[in-house]
């Protein structure tokens, strides 16, 4: 592989690494969305909630003069609970029905698939470095692209979950916004998907430049 190509691959792999870190952060944190109730619920405090793939947390936040609930970063009494279908022994009280069980399970499962693809891609990359097997970068690129797509699906499932929670008559949440875990997931999708495609392009053998050349005539990769 030429030096130019090697540099391109390294930059792409760095972007992929950033995507992996962002994807991991999104999966393990619970600030995908922040939900808040009617402001009139409490005189001095309001109970906002933030949740992720695995658990939901509520926080009693002191209300400011503008009668808004938040931001969620304000200090307050926090109460976190894993979704009951992930931890059958624990009662998630107010939170169980507010999250659509099938949505939550789907988003988490797809996110796990994404991490699986990331692991497979990383194994291929490591093996390609070890014995200069550059052809392993191609399956690696596909795995990273699939991982990005899985993250995208997870993001969309979570969006639908939030929409249903807000629309449902069985919840008190009336307002919402997407938070930094959600942003991490979106950024992870962009990095993994685009970098995966870029890696695929950079790892392909050079196309023949002249009509009389065949792919076999193209200069070898090593």
């Amino acid at each position: 592989m030429s030096q130019t190509k090697t540099l391109k691959v390294r930059v792409t792999l760095f972007c992929i690494l950033a995507g992996i870190v962002l994807a991991m952060t999104a999966v393990v944190t619970d600030h995908w969305a922040v939900l808040s109730p009617h402001m009139e619920h409490h005189n001095t405090t309001c109970e906002a909630a933030h949740f992720g793939l695995w658990r939901i947390c509520t926080k009693r936040i002191p209300m400011d003069d503008s009668k808004t609930c938040g931001p969620i970063t304000l200090p307050g009494e926090k109460n976190c609970s894993y979704f009951r279908h992930f931890n059958p022994g624990e009662s998630s009280e107010i939170f169980e029905f507010t999250t659509q069980k099938e949505y939550s399970i789907s988003a988490a499962a797809i996110a796990i698939f994404s991490l699986g693809f990331v692991i497979l891609g990383s194994l291929c990359v490591l093996l390609s470095f070890g014995k200069k097997r550059d052809y392993l970068l191609r399956p690696a690129s596909m795995f990273y692209t699939f991982a990005g797509l899985c993250i995208l699906v997870s993001v969309e499932v979570m969006r639908q979950s939030v929409k249903r929670m807000i629309d449902s008559e069985d919840t008190v949440w009336i307002e919402y916004y997407y938070s930094w875990s959600f942003a991490c997931a979106c950024a992870a999708f962009v990095l993994l998907f685009l970098s995966g495609l870029a890696l695929l392009l950079f790892s392909l053998p050079r196309m023949p430049r002249n009509p009389w050349e065949s792919c076999m005539d193209a200069e070898p990769e090593h």
């Epitope: 009617h38 107010i94 449902s168 008559e169 069985d170 919840t171 009336i174 307002e175």
Partner: antibody, heavy 116, light 108 residues
């Protein structure tokens, strides 16, 4: 399919306490919010307040000083108590599933008349 | 609290005609959180529309909701005999929840 049924006395004397019970069938009272509303004859509906199965409640400010909503999960019931009633409290009282949004599941309603 | 005013109080129409019911709020309703109900005499209200324009489950598509801010409309495209009832609007944009006084749709 969840069904709700209100029960209680149809006649209450002024200054006394109005007590109604809503029995939930077809679903557990757990994990849901439950609401009381009322409709005076020929008038619009009025939201009284709601309770969560864990016991936390929220009331309409105009009735807050007189109203108490409680829940009995073992019987799958929730109740309304309205103190110091007057003729203005004469209405059809409804129980419904939900809290502070719209209401899809309602009881049939029970008419309570306040009269001596 | 938000006061909801429905107009007209009574609407006289024939089956097959189009009905347009209005609900005006005393202040802006957050996120268009408005619902419409149909109520038959001696029965509980039946949810028709929520979120100003979303039809509830099993509600025929002749019922549609529109509007935003302070002005909302329920439209029944072709009145069926069973549609001649009382219709109420309800806001859930802020507490306390409030309802309109209702519009009675009667046969002309």
């Amino acid at each position: 399919q969840v069904q709700l049924q209100e029960s209680g006395p149809g006649l209450v004397k002024p200054s006394e306490t109005l007590s109604l019970t809503c029995t939930v069938s077809g679903d557990s009272i757990n994990n849901y919010y439950w609401t009381w509303l009322r409709q005076p004859p020929g008038k619009g509906l009025e939201w009284i307040g709601y309770i969560y199965y864990s016991g936390s409640a929220n009331y309409n400010p105009s009735l807050k000083s007189r109203v108490t909503i409680s829940v009995d999960t073992s019987k799958n019931q929730f109740s309304l108590k309205l103190n110091s009633v007057t003729a203005a409290d004469t209405a059809v009282y409804y129980c419904a599933r939900g809290a502070v949004k719209y209401f899809r599941h309602w009881g049939q309603g029970t008419l309570v008349t306040v009269s001596s | 609290e938000i006061v909801l005013t429905q107009s007209p109080g009574t609407l006289s129409l024939s089956p097959g005609e189009r009905a347009t019911l209005s609900c005006r709020a005393s202040q802006t309703i957050n996120h268009n959180n408005l619902a419409w109900y149909q109520q038959r005499p001696g029965q509980a209200p039946r949810l028709l529309i929520y979120g100003a324009s979303n039809r509830a489950t099993a509600i025929p598509d002749r019922f549609s909701g529109s509007g935003s801010g302070t002005d909302f409309t329920l439209t029944i495209s072709r009145l069926e005999p069973e549609d001649f009832e009382v219709y109420s609007c309800q806001q859930y944009g802020s507490l306390p929840l409030t309802f309109g006084g209702g519009t009675k749709v009667e046969i002309k």
